[in-house]
Amino acid sequence: IWELKKDVYVVELDWYPDAPGEMVVLTCDTPEEDGITWTLDQSSEVLGSGKTLTIQVKEFGDAGQYTCHKGGEVLSHSLLLLHKKEDGIWSTDILKDQKEPKNKTFLRCEAKNYSGRFTCWWLTTISTDLTFSVKSSRGSSDPQGVTCGAATLSAERVRGDNKEYEYSVECQEDSACPAAEESLPIEVMVDAVHKLKYENYTSSFFIRDIIKPDPPKNLQLKPLKNSRQVEVSWEYPDTWSTPHSYFSLTFCVQVQGKSKREKKDRVFTDKTSATVICRKNASISVRAQDRYYSSSWSEWASVPCS
């Protein structure tokens, strides 16, 4: 048993049919010694008396808020949550496996630049009685500070007969050095509590591996005289690290016809302009990627040819 926060405790339960459970001793936080009784949740049934209460925790029915009283007065509370392990595997019931980039991906994180700021998000089908707490650090043995905000509900969508909820959190490395080579990964830890169930989820990554630039901005077309060609120009996104001479991007320019089946013409360039042939009803799209490290491409920025 360990303390999650004040008066909230997590019992780690290795569960299997007929498992003996975990013996837990609760102590009433009071100088009183006599006349103390214990109850669970809203029940008035007295579970025991004395300054300590020993219980055998076998299932969720044994979890909840234990209260010690004396003469009708509440002395203290202890909320017991369960963290369940089955066949040697901790439960992962609260969050949905996003399966990207691989199975058992519950947390996904992205950074728009090398400033040490990043966003993580996760999915659940649970709509009520749900709380999240997020902690992060650089490295784990001698951790360096990363400050995370509160997790917030960022999107809701319907998937079949299910509603899916997306939560996200923003974190910032306290002493980020954008130009430095990373040697220790960022660790992100999410505590999830649903009703009386506790679960924890972790992700470990280097900022360089989760970089996804914003799309190029100010995408413009300039027709070239007496030609079907156009000059496409764009700028680095505002959110990208500076100076651009050091934090350089490479770009992919694509000409796409109205039909998805039409052949796409693609040009790769390190410049912020390119010359392409603009077909009728086609559109021109540009996306960006770190020039020196193959992390994710940005989303496309697009303009119609006409």
Epitope: E59, G61, E86, D87, D93, D161, N162, K163, K197
Partner: nanobody
């Protein structure tokens, strides 16, 4: 919301078998831990069995262990309770329940309930 409808109850002789079904509709059945409870006249609702959503792990009350088997078919959105070697003390209204916590024998850990099906075991 999940709607639960039990069926399969009836009158049997002691020692005989019966299979109860609980059909779920509404939100995704596979997101829920499922349980069976029973209530005899003048008594509190009593836990019978539960089955987990992921691994179909099972959990039984001592009084039915070895005699009753709970199972689920996520494709059919149905949970079953196979009852054998029935005794007169198994007579009760049997309720199907859906919740978020497995294992739990506590009725208030279940969020959705069916209307119940009567099982009567005569000696």
């Amino acid at each position: 919301e999940v709607q639960l409808v039990e069926s399969g109850g009836g009158v049997v002789q002691a020692g005989e078998s019966l299979r109860l079904s609980c059909a779920a509709s509404g939100r995704s059945f596979s997101n829920y831990e499922m349980g069976w409870f029973r209530q005899a006249p003048g008594t509190e609702r009593e836990f019978v069995a539960a089955i987990s959503r992921r691994r179909s792990s099972t959990y039984y009350a001592d009084s039915v262990k070895g005699r009753f088997t709970i199972s689920r078919d996520n494709a059919k959105n149905t949970v079953y309770l196979q009852m054998s070697s029935l005794k007169p003390e198994d007579t009760a209204v049997y309720y199907c329940a859906a919740g978020a916590l497995f294992p739990s024998s506590r009725s208030r850990d279940y969020d959705y309930w069916g209307q119940g099906t009567q099982v009567t075991v005569s000696s």
